[in-house]
């Protein structure tokens, strides 16, 4: 009986030879639980697993706990790839995390993360990030040193308020922070002035709501 | 620690006045701009008005121009929305918010306008 190949990440389906963009099924490290993702082959080399996308508002992102945990939308548009494959992933090596965003006026930069993980979920799967580089600012609009991620029905932040209920969306806030990529979405024209849009503060400071952004990951020794 | 807090709302007739304050601390309150956003039940956050850090350009929302009036007091770290000519929709909890990094807020203040 022939045997199956599993990929772990994007990375591992693009050293196979699969170098088309596209979704493919990935494995959970130490497991046989599967999970669609969308696989980047082409930008900076390729091998890129996509953990987050906006670019329309066809997706809802004011979602539970248990929504970021397991992933939610579709990962040919919309989506976010889900917390507990994210975390189990980047804690058995060590991944780089790229941010890629884009203004209502046809500008793009990004940030670059040099050493990226999630805490499991015991710990609220708080952020790690280290060395930062990028043209999206050079201060990073994730705060530091990472805070617990915080959804509607999950409040783990540093604010009086309820951040996430306010803010919408599950991110890492703070109180409530520089950042928040899972805000509601405001098409253009309406996107200035939003306090609970699509935020990387600095980049485009605190009232401007993107038009599109993606995270990705990928193996530091890639 | 940084803190704002709002005071100043209440049960209003239409066509009547209300003042609410931010006090401010735990930052350098007269480096940043400030703002006033509101919050109707089962709505999103909505901007109404920002102040500048030395008090002297301001921005309104449409839906109150010329109805409210932005103000601080730097040397007391305190932000002012004065609110006349109150109309039923504009019954929601108003926090004010700080243009730092952190986008600091308050717990916010209720304000009902009805007759």
């Known amino acids: 009986k022939e045997e199956q190949i599993s990929f772990r990440d994007c990375a591992e389906v693009f050293k196979s030879g699969h170098t088309t963009n596209g979704i493919y099924t990935l494995t959970f490290p130490n497991s046989t639980e599967e999970i669609k993702a969308y696989c980047d082959m082409e930008a900076g080399g390729g091998g890129w697993t996509i953990i987050q996308r906006r670019e329309d508002g066809s997706v809802d992102f004011q979602r539970t706990w248990k929504e970021y945990k397991v992933g939610f939308g579709n990962p040919s548009g919309e989506y976010w790839l889900g917390n507990e494959f994210v975390s189990q992933l980047t804690n058995q090596q060590r991944y780089v995390l790229k941010i890629h965003l884009k203004d209502w006026e046809g500008n793009e930069a990004y940030s670059l993360y040099e050493h990226f993980y999630l805490s499991s979920e015991e710990l609220n799967y708080r952020i790690h990030l280290k060395g930062l580089t990028g043209t999206a600012g050079k201060i990073s609009s994730i705060s530091q040193p990472g805070n617990d991620f915080s959804t509607k029905d999950g409040d783990n932040d540093k604010c009086i308020c309820k951040c996430s209920q306010m803010l919408t969306g599950g991110w890492w806030f703070d109180a409530c922070g520089p950042s928040n990529l899972n805000g509601m979405y405001y098409p253009q024209r309406q996107n200035t002035n939003k306090f609970n849009g699509i935020k990387w503060y600095y980049w485009k400071g605190s009232g401007y709501s993107l038009k599109a952004t993606t995270m990705m990951i990928r193996p530091a020794d890639f | 620690d940084v803190q704002l807090q709002e005071s100043g709302g209440g049960l209003v007739q239409p066509g009547g006045s209300l003042r609410l304050s931010c006090a401010a601390s735990?930052?350098?309150?007269?480096?940043?701009?400030m703002s006033w956003v509101r919050q109707a039940p089962g709505k999103g956050l909505e901007w109404v008005s920002t102040?500048?850090?030395?008090?002297?350009?301001?921005g309104y929302a449409d839906s109150v121009k010329g109805r409210f009036t932005i103000s601080r007091d730097n040397a007391k770290n305190t932000l002012y929305l004065q609110m006349n000519s109150l109309k039923p929709e504009d019954t929601a909890i108003y926090y004010c918010?700080?243009?730092?990094?952190?986008?600091?807020w308050g717990q916010g203040t209720q304000v009902t306008v009805s007759s």
């Open positions: 735990g930052f350098t309150f007269n480096s940043y701009a």
């Open positions: 102040i500048n850090s030395g008090g002297g350009r301001t």
């Open positions: 918010n700080a243009d730092h990094p952190q986008g600091y």
